[in-house]
């Protein structure tokens, strides 16, 4: 008789999830010499231990602590790029500007990027059918708690000048409910972080508005200033040209505004 299984509103665990995590770990540790000491089997065991046999609406940051410990990594704290709703461009940027890092350029972020996972209470099975949706089901699900945990730690580690890439095409350029708005902003450390600089990425070809004057950016400035951190904002009118100029800063067209 097939066991009754809880139906959640979100997609199920990404197929071949264990193999994917293990393979990503091996690849990452091969590419990054400073992480060669990491035992990927132990990493997978710690990852699995965070959610297997646990109710997928009752996951805590504590559950991920063994994984956090194994994935401890030092990135230059003054080279951190945060992002909100514009992941692809942020990743394209750090692929070119190799001395800057998004969360997904760290081991833990790289392992989990674009993946979904959850288990079931009291069974060692991974649920490939459905997983809790943050809005419709519960916020303390394995995926949300993971990103909240790693995002908090990443923001806490940041220092000096921190950059954040924001999507100027969205109705809320700064969204208080995003991971950046709800977690990272509040975990930047005053005095340790001197300045948060927002890069507002324009979508439209002919969009010459100053999106740094957008009410949601003013809201971000207010939150940041109340935390005793300086705030700066720049419009990136031409993201394609911006990336090109990061690749070839000597290009004569790169002196003008991008």
């Amino acid at each position: 008789v097939p066991r009754w299984r809880q139906q959640w509103s979100g997609p199920g665990t990404t197929k071949r999830f264990p193999e994917t995590v293990l393979a990503r770990c091996v690849k990452y540790t091969e590419i990054h010499p400073e992480m060669r000491h990491v035992d990927c089997q132990s990493v997978w065991d710690a990852f699995k231990g965070a959610f297997i046999s646990k109710h997928p609406c009752n996951i805590t940051e504590e559950d991920y602590q063994p994984l956090m410990k194994l994935g401890t990594q030092t990135v230059p704290c003054n080279k951190i790029l945060l992002w909100s709703r514009i992941k692809d461009l942020a990743h394209q940027f750090t692929q070119v500007q190799r001395d800057m890092f998004t969360l997904e350029d760290t081991l833990l972020g790289y392992l989990a990027d674009d993946l979904t996972w959850c288990g079931e209470f009291n069974t060692s099975k991974i649920n490939y059918q459905s997983c809790p949706d943050w809005r419709k089901d519960c916020s303390n699900n394995p995926v949300s708690v993971f990103w909240k945990t790693v995002s908090r730690r990443f923001a806490e580690a940041a220092c000096d000048v921190v950059h954040v890439m924001l999507n100027g095409s969205r109705s809320k350029i700064f969204d208080k409910n995003s991971t950046f708005g709800s977690v990272e902003v509040h975990n930047l450390q005053p005095e340790k972080v001197q300045t948060l600089e927002a890069w507002v990425i324009h979508g439209g070809r002919e969009d010459s508005r100053d999106l740094c004057q957008d009410p949601t950016i003013k809201e971000l400035e207010s939150i940041i200033s109340k935390r005793n951190i300086q705030f700066s904002c720049k419009n990136i009118y031409r993201p394609d040209k911006f990336l090109q100029c990061v690749k070839n800063p000597e290009d004569s067209s790169c002196t003008s505004e991008i």
């Epitope: 003054n78 220092c159 000096d160 000048v161 450390q189 005095e191 340790k192 972080v193 001197q194 300045t195 600089e197 200033s225 109340k226 005793n228 300086q230 700066s232 720049k234």
Partner: antibody, heavy 122, light 107 residues
Framework: QVQLVESGGGLVQPGGSLRLSCAAS????????MHWVRQAPGKGLEWVSN????????YYADSVKGRFTISRDNSKNTLYLQMNSLRAEDTAVYYC???????????????WGQGTLVTVSS | DIQMTQSPSSLSASVGDRVTITCRAS??????LNWYQQKPGKAPKLLIY???NLQSGVPSRFSGSGSGTDFTLTISSLQPEDFATYYC?????????FGQGTKVEIK
């Protein structure tokens, strides 16, 4: 009123050590980040180091990294700079300064001590 | 680190003259630029913060302007007490840096 008084300067041989102190009064010391800034004779101002209000975070100029250590004792309202492996080029007047932050000002060094002279020579 | 370049390194002027000092940052520092005045044997004194804001007690003949990488300090009518060395300072980064200074001397 705000007062910062440096002490501990003097003549020291190359390779030697010295510990500077900065006694703060007239403000709630534990609420402010602090800086050390130096000025070689006849030269400009060079930032050396700063420390977070609670002492949990420090920055150093590349020229002193690994040799100088900034610290503070909030119970004594005192800032310190431990200087090891001193070189002739460390000869300067060392100032402590308060890091003031407000939304209107952003980050400034608003109050400075009168400085203490460190001479590194054999 | 961000380099700050001041010019000129020294200038001679008379009382009543209009004096302009420029400061250039090696990268965009937004509006996080402060100016200090230092007299011989004394500690520096904050004059202007965030490009153009006068610190309390500073006379209105001092003014600042600029943004991004290029900044200017202007003394509209030089007074005897203004003969001193002036420094720009970037506070965009936690590793604050100063310009090399501009010495304003009596002609």
């Amino acid at each position: 009123q705000v007062q910062l008084v440096e002490s501990g300067g003097g003549l020291v041989q190359p390779g030697g050590s010295l510990r500077l102190s900065c006694a703060a009064s007239g403000f709630t010391f534990s609420n402010y980040g602090m800086h050390w800034v130096r000025q070689a004779p006849g030269k400009g101002l060079e930032w050396v180091s700063n420390i977070r209000s609670d002492g949990s975070w420090t920055y150093y100029a590349d020229s002193v990294k690994g040799r100088f250590t900034i610290s503070r004792d909030n119970s004594k309202n005192t800032l310190y700079l431990q200087m090891n492996s001193l070189r002739a080029e460390d000869t300067a007047v060392y100032y402590c300064a308060r890091r003031y932050w407000s939304k209107s000002h952003a980050s400034v060094t608003d109050y400075w001590g009168q400085g203490t002279l460190v001479t590194v020579s054999s | 680190d961000i380099q700050m370049t001041q010019s000129p390194s020294s200038l001679s002027a008379s009382v009543g003259d209009r004096v302009t000092i420029t400061c250039r940052a090696s990268q965009d520092i937004s509006a996080f630029l402060n100016w200090y005045q230092q007299k011989p044997g004394k500690a520096p004194k904050l004059l202007i913060y965030k490009v153009s804001n006068l610190q309390s007690g500073v006379p209105s003949r001092f003014s600042g302007s600029g943004s991004g990488t290029d900044f200017t300090l202007t003394i509209s009518s030089l007074q005897p007490e203004d003969f001193a060395t002036y420094y720009c300072q970037q506070a965009y980064s936690g590793s604050i840096t100063f310009g090399q200074g501009t010495k304003v001397e009596i002609k």
